[in-house]
């Protein structure tokens, strides 16, 4: 014997209180598959969450984050704050990149400047908190006979300035 509920399409539920007939999902609820005995409550995008896609009878609402935040977790379950370029988000908030490191994005960690001398090159443009160094030609190419290699920036753990 076929289960009568299997005929209920997405957007409906099999109503046990009404001889298992297919009833439409009530407002603010949905069923994304057929044969459901209940409809799920729609997700509400409140606070720092904003609605990316409205809930329908067959699919849940989708949220993203308001400006100044970005999504984390499955289905944007969390909103993490953006930082400025030249900063990284730590457990204690946004902190400036320490000397010798940079971050050119609003998220992620500060990364060490490129060590030009490892490739036998010189520093053409100094690094900043927001930008990596720009490596130029090798010192030998610039002035034959001279070897004024720019010393590399000290390697530190990204972002953690010594106390």
């Amino acid at each position: 014997l076929q289960d009568p509920c299997s005929n209920c399409p997405a957007g409906t539920f099999c109503d046990n209180n009404r001889n298992q007939i297919c009833s439409p999902c009530p407002p603010n609820s949905f069923s994304s598959a057929g044969g459901q005995r209940t409809c799920d409550i729609c997700r509400q995008c409140k606070g720092v969450f904003r609605t990316r896609k409205e809930c329908s009878s067959t699919s849940n609402a989708e949220c993203d984050c308001t400006p100044g935040f970005h999504c984390l977790g499955a289905g944007c379950s969390m909103c993490e704050q953006d930082c400025k370029q030249g900063q990284e988000l730590t457990k204690k908030g946004c902190k400036d990149c320490c000397f010798g490191t940079f971050n050119d994005q609003k998220r992620g960690i500060c990364r060490p400047w490129t060590n030009c001398s490892l490739d036998g090159k010189s520093v053409l443009v100094n690094g900043t908190k927001e930008r990596d160094v720009v490596c130029g030609p090798s010192p030998a190419d610039l002035s034959p006979g001279a070897s004024s290699v720019t010393p590399p920036a000290p390697a530190r753990e990204p972002g953690h300035s010594p106390q």
Epitope: L89, K91, K92
Partner: nanobody
């Protein structure tokens, strides 16, 4: 598949207590530090506490220090957060998070997997 499942949230009066649990699966639990983070209704994510893989090192946000205690039972693959002297400002969705290494600190965000969260409401 790495999974984290939080439980223990609910409605509690100011000054009350709750104990949150996070059941972990799909990875070697004792090899990774774990954290609790929370998201209040109108705010971004806030770090609450972290614990090393062995449980030997713990760290807390200033806002919860002395009130919350993080712990873990590696034999049960479970992380805990004991919350005492709860305040209205502790109202939030609490997420447990796996970190990317065995050790942790109170500086670097190193979380790579999160649970779906459990809601804590502190209200009279």
């Amino acid at each position: 598949e790495v999974q984290l499942l939080e439980s223990g949230g609910g409605l509690v009066q100011p000054g009350g207590s709750l104990r949150l649990s996070c059941a972990a699966s799909g990875f070697t639990f004792s090899s990774y530090a774990m954290s609790w983070v929370r998201q209040a209704p109108e705010k971004g994510l806030e770090w609450v506490s972290s614990i090393s893989g062995s449980g030997g090192s713990t760290f807390y946000a200033d806002s919860v220090k002395g009130r919350f205690t993080i712990s873990r039972d590696n034999s049960k693959n479970t992380l805990y957060l004991q919350m005492n002297s709860l305040r209205a400002e502790d109202t939030a969705v609490y997420f447990c998070a796996k970190e990317g290494a065995t050790e942790t600190d109170d500086y670097h965000f190193n979380t790579d997997v999160w649970g779906q969260g459990t809601t804590v409401t502190v209200s009279s």
